[in-house]
């Protein structure tokens, strides 16, 4: 632990100041693990001008860094890139005269506190008006900045000619896209400053190209994948005063396939389980021995959870007996295309066979096995898939 | 080399002010925290409070927080302490001394008697 | 006000080794580094040891210092006469947000 500091397991208080730290403080290999620590609390280190880039890097679990009557002059941009679990920075009552949002923009703070600082009079601040002006009034913090004629000014009256917010709008066309086919997307930005523009797409999975020029930018999509049904696509506007986005989501349509079908399982009732992916919503249809399976309140499906375009669910069966021993056959089919898969049930040995000889049966008995189970004498339900059981759970990825 | 020199030593009547310096030379004068050091007669050393001269920055004991002020001019490498209406128990020894590793630079002393 | 405890005296004859010991709080000692002082008689104060244990250029290395949880204490071995002072501890307190000096020890060289 450097002199004038103090380090435990998860915390480092350097607040002595002299000698000071002309540095911010870095732990020595071999010692407490730098991953761990979640507070920084430095005070009173005049000699401590500049947060590099590196310096904070290797405190990944940092919540808080406070750095408060201090000498701190300069941030480097990317000082806190890799330490996204940052909620409460303090940089009361140092030498700051500017500080770009660039710095902050990938963190979600709780806490920016920015007070007693000789903050310059000029656009790269007007970031902090913006934030001091969404910001509810408990808040609210006294920032000043001194204008040209080093006048201490606050940072509410702040007006800088040509310093706005950006505009982003996206000229999508329809994003509903078969799968493997190709897209692209136009987005046009403006502002003053000039903004930059860049595409936020999040995960996406399928293969994508930029190009941008001046205040114009396409993304090309091609041979898009089922994947990034649903995902969010967004054109960014960023500028030194803060930035603006237009998004779009992605639907993509696909033939069905069946991801998932297993020999059935009791629990409440039997259970043939299934995952069907498809978009648009798949119909089910079930066969039992090569024919329709006609479903009723003893035999039907049941969607449990939905995920975009992912359903899974279960064949239900109210007490079946060895009448309802075979195979199961699920197709699931939608304009696009069609998807079968079979599995064998085997529910119950039929009355009369020994078990100790018939080790595969399942260890199921009934006391009432001879009761019919009563399929077959419904007509044949809505070939859409049912409604759920559970209420829609869609995960959307951003 | 690095010295403090400590203005001479004082005599004041009661309700009286007074302003007593400490001139560093040989140093950057800016980059160090000062302070002031008070013994009374036959006593031990008390800590005042502090100061940085780059920024006027300053830390008071919670003793002497509203009794004194510390105060510094970097243009000419001075740090002062003061008092705006004194005391007979004022009267004492005070040191500044710059604050590195420890106290490392100690001035001479300046003596302030304080009677009516 | 918290200040450092010091025994108020201490002594030894020529040659021997004395301790002095400065006890204090987590916020102060426990926490912090500790650096100890010589005043000689109608003289300034003397830095004798920082960070604990560290000599400055000048300082005999009959003077050294040691620091273990909240207590710090001054060994002195060879003692000469010149060695006749009073002998301060003094810590950075977190809680004070300032220092704090011990309570001083009179060393006499019998």
């Known amino acids: 632990c450097p002199t004038s500091c103090k380090c435990s397991s998860a915390r480092i208080w350097c607040t002595e100041p002299s000698p000071g730290i002309v540095a911010f403080p870095r732990l020595e290999p071999n010692s407490v693990d730098p991953e761990n620590i979640t507070e920084i609390l430095i005070a009173n280190q005049k000699r401590l001008e500049i947060i590099n880039e590196d310096d904070v890097e290797a405190y990944v679990g940092l919540r808080n860094l406070t750095i408060v009557d201090s000498g701190l002059k300069f941030v480097a941009y990317k000082a806190f890139l890799k330490n996204s679990n940052l909620r409460h920075i303090n940089f009361t009552r140092n030498k700051l005269t500017s500080l770009s949002r660039r710095h902050f923009r990938h963190l979600d703070l709780s806490d920016l506190i920015l007070t007693g600082n000789p903050f310059t009079c000029s656009c790269d601040i007007m970031w902090l008006k913006t934030l001091q002006e969404t910001k509810s009034s408990p808040d609210t913090q006294d920032l000043y900045c001194l204008n040209e004629s080093s006048k201490n000014m606050p940072l509410a009256n702040l007006q800088i000619p040509n310093c706005g917010l950006p505009s982003a709008r996206l000229a999508a066309p329809n994003l509903t896209v078969e799968e493997g086919k190709s897209v692209t997307l136009s987005c046009s930005v403006g502002g003053d400053p000039l903004p930059t523009l860049y595409w936020d797409v999040g995960n996406l999975v399928s293969k994508h190209m930029n190009e941008t020029s001046h205040t114009q930018g396409s993304l090309r999509i091609t041979n898009i994948s089922s994947d990034d049904s649903g995902k969010q696509i967004s054109c960014v506007a960023e500028n030194l005063v803060g930035e603006d986005q237009d998004s779009v989501n992605l639907t993509v349509h696909f033939a069905p396939t069946i991801t998932f079908l297993e020999s059935p399982t009791s629990d409440h009732h039997w259970c043939i389980p299934f995952t069907v992916r498809g978009n648009p919503k798949p119909a089910l249809q079930w066969f039992y021995n090569g024919a329709i399976l006609n479903e009723s309140k003893y035999i039907c499906t049941k969607i449990h959870v939905t995920n975009h375009t992912e359903y899974h669910g279960c064949l239900q069966l109210d007490n079946p007996t060895h009448m309802n021993n075979g195979d199961y056959t699920l197709m699931a089919k939608n304009e696009y295309g069609k998807d079968e898969r079979q599995i064998s049930a085997h529910f119950m040995g039929r009355p009369g066979v020994d078990y100790e000889t018939n080790p595969n049966y399942p260890e199921v008995l009934y006391e009432d096995w001879t009761t019919p189970t009563d399929i077959g004498d419904t007509t044949n339900k809505s070939n859409e898939i049912p409604s759920t059981d559970v209420a829609d759970q869609s995960n959307r990825e951003h | 080399q690095v010295q403090l020199v400590q203005s001479g030593a004082e005599v004041k009547k009661p309700g009286e002010s007074l302003k007593i310096s400490c001139k560093g030379s040989g140093y950057s004068f800016t980059s160090y925290w000062i302070g002031w050091v008070r013994q009374m007669p036959g006593k031990g050393l008390e800590w005042m409070g502090i100061?940085?001269?780059?920024?006027?920055?300053?830390r008071y004991s919670p003793s002497f927080q509203g009794q004194v002020t510390i105060s510094a001019d970097k243009s000419i490498s001075t740090a002062y302490l003061q008092w705006s209406s004194l005391k007979a128990s004022d009267t004492a020894m005070y040191y500044c001394?710059?604050?590195?590793?420890?106290?490392?630079?100690w001035g001479q002393g300046t003596m302030v008697t304080v009677s009516s | 006000l918290p200040v450092l405890t010091q025994p108020p005296s201490a002594s030894g004859t020529p040659g021997q080794r004395v301790t002095i010991s400065c006890s204090g709080s987590r916020s102060n000692v426990g926490g912090n580094t500790v650096s100890w002082y010589q005043q000689l008689p109608g003289s300034a104060p003397k830095l004798l040891i920082y960070t604990n244990n560290q000599r400055p250029s000048g300082v005999p290395d009959r003077f050294s210092g040691s620091k273990s949880g909240t207590s710090a204490s001054l060994a002195i071995s060879g003692l000469q006469s010149e060695d006749e002072a009073d002998y301060y501890c003094a810590a950075w307190d977190d809680s004070l947000n300032g220092y704090v000096f011990g309570t001083g020890t009179q060393l006499t060289v019998l």
């Open positions: 001394a710059r604050h590195d590793y420890g106290m490392d630079v």
């Open positions: 100061i940085y001269p780059g920024d006027s920055d300053t």
